[in-house]
């Protein structure tokens, strides 16, 4: 027997649809109606014929009441050909549910998102996560996407992005995002954060993650910071192959003082980066190649310095380092 | 409309045995986590056992109080759910609520309630 | 066991003002960015009704007058304004962790 599309968890939490079928029957999607978290993946489908049997152009406001019903609050849809028509009616028709997070991932849109109608209502999320998502409509595609969103979002992720650089000029300012994600987007470069970090775009970000982006140098990534505006208090570079030198003719750069944690583990380091913030509440330099232990001289004044998985490091020993904490157990690195 | 009916309940001496039944519809029973949930006279909210689903291998949970004497099982064939009460105590006199679970809360439908009283 | 304490134990109120029950818990309910804290409501010879799920989701039928915050330990359900039918004792219950538990119950009456 074919298994169900969809599986239902039994405490009706969580619903996961699987469409594999050539002509799935969307209908079992029914059963997810009364779960929290729902994760719709079309098996890789072309839902271009799905325009035809719905109305896209339809007033969302005869849905207002079933849709107001729904529980959902996390949805996931994966693995499709969208076309942007229907994309923006399936918005449209949320921005009446109670949907606080949206993930999408490995979508293919084509055609571009028509402009929000006056009367139309964005939807209201907190979070909007992105992973493999390509866009008919190049770099204008965040500026598309955030007119049919109401300015609330607070947390904002962007991974292996086809064209991670936004038409700036276009994109308005998400005056309440605190996170932004940019990680696993390794052709990104600090070139292409500097394109991404539309200035002053981006005035509450507290949390900036840019993990495997290519990134060369924290000078670097510090004078994309200063050119966009974005001071961040906890930053994330873990997982790039980290230069520790910096080039004598770049400029010196000045960390935001907001900064207080910085995660440099994974970087490849075999000696601590010069230009690093003067005072941090956490830095992390776990699972890097350095060969013994930093001077005082070469760290920040730091409350909370991880140094676990190096090659220096004999599980046990401590380090001389005020404040240092370590597990004394190497870790998976 | 999901109804459940629980019913068993009943006056029983201590160390006696009582089996409760609850009787469910209006819903595809054999997907859901069931709970019994009790309050003794005057006080709070209990709750005392659950039954996962087939899917999950219909796992039990019980509450310390009455782990070793109560057994809950369930029949999705007839779309009900059991207690079996066994060596009662007379702490175990309460309001016996059969719960059914939605959106990731394990108690929004309550049946009515059957009491048991184990009284000397 | 995750031990929920409630407080205050009863609260007597003036129609149309407002009500504020808290709800601590000894470690936190959160998981995966849920708060698994539920809010419900009981009348004299009545079974319990959900009114809050998942913090701060108003059940379906609930009038708006309810509302549930809060996240990992610290969580409250307010009435506001309060009304005559809303005399009853109002629970907390989680079940993040095994065993699910209810705090021991605050009863509302109106001055």
């Known amino acids: 027997t074919t298994p169900e599309p969809c599986e239902l968890d039994d405490e009706d939490f969580r619903c996961v649809c699987n469409f594999s079928e050539p002509q799935p029957d969307w209908s079992e999607a029914f059963q997810c109606v009364s779960a929290v978290e729902v994760e719709i993946h079309a098996g890789g489908l072309n839902l271009e014929p799905f325009l035809k049997r719905v109305d896209a152009d339809a007033d969302p406001r005869q849905y207002a009441d079933t849709v107001k019903a729904l529980r959902v609050r996390r949805l996931t849809v994966g693995a499709a050909q969208v076309p942007a028509q229907l994309l923006v009616g399936a918005l449209r028709v949320l921005a009446y549910s109670r949907l606080k997070e949206l993930t999408l991932e490995d979508l293919k849109i084509t055609g571009t998102m028509p402009p929000l109608p006056l009367e139309a209502t964005g939807l209201a999320l907190s979070s909007l996560r992105l992973r493999n998502v390509s866009w008919a409509t190049g770099r204008s595609w965040l500026a598309e996407l955030q007119q049919w969103l109401k300015p609330g979002l607070k947390v904002l992720s962007i991974a292996q992005a086809h064209s991670p650089a936004f038409s700036c000029e276009q994109v308005r300012a998400f005056p309440a995002l605190t996170s932004l994600d940019l990680s696993d987007n390794p052709g990104l470069g600090e070139r292409g954060l500097m394109a991404a970090l539309c200035p002053h775009k981006f005035p509450a970000i507290q949390n900036l993650a840019l993990r495997n982006t290519g990134m060369e140098t924290p000078t670097g990534v510090c004078a994309a910071l200063a050119a966009a505006g974005v001071q961040p208090h906890s930053l994330d570079l873990s997982h790039n192959s980290l230069r520790a030198t910096v080039n004598p003719s770049a400029p010196r750069c000045m960390w935001s003082s907001a900064l207080n944690s910085l995660n440099l583990s994974f970087a490849g380091l075999e000696q601590v980066p010069k230009g690093l913030p003067a005072k941090l509440r956490v830095l992390d330099l776990s699972c890097n190649r350095l060969n013994r232990a930093p001077q005082p001289d070469e760290l920040p004044e730091v409350d909370n310095l991880t140094l676990d998985g190096n090659p220096f490091l004999v599980p046990g020993t401590a380090l001389p380092h005020e404040g240092s904490m370590n597990s004394g157990v190497v870790p998976a690195c | 409309e999901v109804q459940l009916v629980e019913s068993g309940g009943g006056l029983m001496q201590p160390k006696g045995s009582l089996k409760l039944s609850c009787a469910a519809s209006g819903f595809t029973f054999k997907t859901y986590a069931l709970n019994w949930v009790r309050q003794a006279p005057g006080t709070g909210l209990e709750w005392v056992a659950r039954?996962?689903?087939?899917?999950?291998?219909?796992?039990?949970y019980y509450a310390d109080s009455v782990k070793d004497r109560f057994t809950i099982s369930r029949d999705d064939s007839q779309n009900m759910l059991y207690l079996q009460m066994n060596n009662l105590k007379t702490e175990d006199t309460a309001m016996y609520y059969c719960?059914?679970?939605?959106?990731?809360?394990?108690?929004?439908?309550w049946g009515q309630g059957t009491l048991v009283t184990v009284s000397a | 066991n995750i031990v929920l304490t409630q407080s205050p134990a009863s609260l007597a109120v003036s129609l149309g003002q407002r009500a504020t029950i808290s709800c601590r818990a000894s470690e936190s309910v959160d998981s995966y960015g849920n708060s698994f804290m539920h809010w419900y409501q009981q009348k004299p010879g009545q079974p319990p009704k959900l009114l809050i799920y998942?913090?701060?989701n108003l059940e379906s039928g609930v009038p708006a007058r309810f509302s549930g915050s809060g996240s990992r330990t610290d969580f409250t359900l307010t009435i506001d304004p309060v009304e005559a039918d809303d005399v009853a004792t109002y629970y907390c219950q989680q079940n993040n962790g095994d065993p699910y538990t209810f705090g021991g119950g605050t009863k509302l009456e109106i001055i």
């Open positions: 719960v059914r679970p939605q959106s990731g809360t394990s108690f929004a439908y």
């Open positions: 998942l913090a701060s």
């Open positions: 039954i996962r689903s087939k899917s999950n291998n219909y796992t039990t």
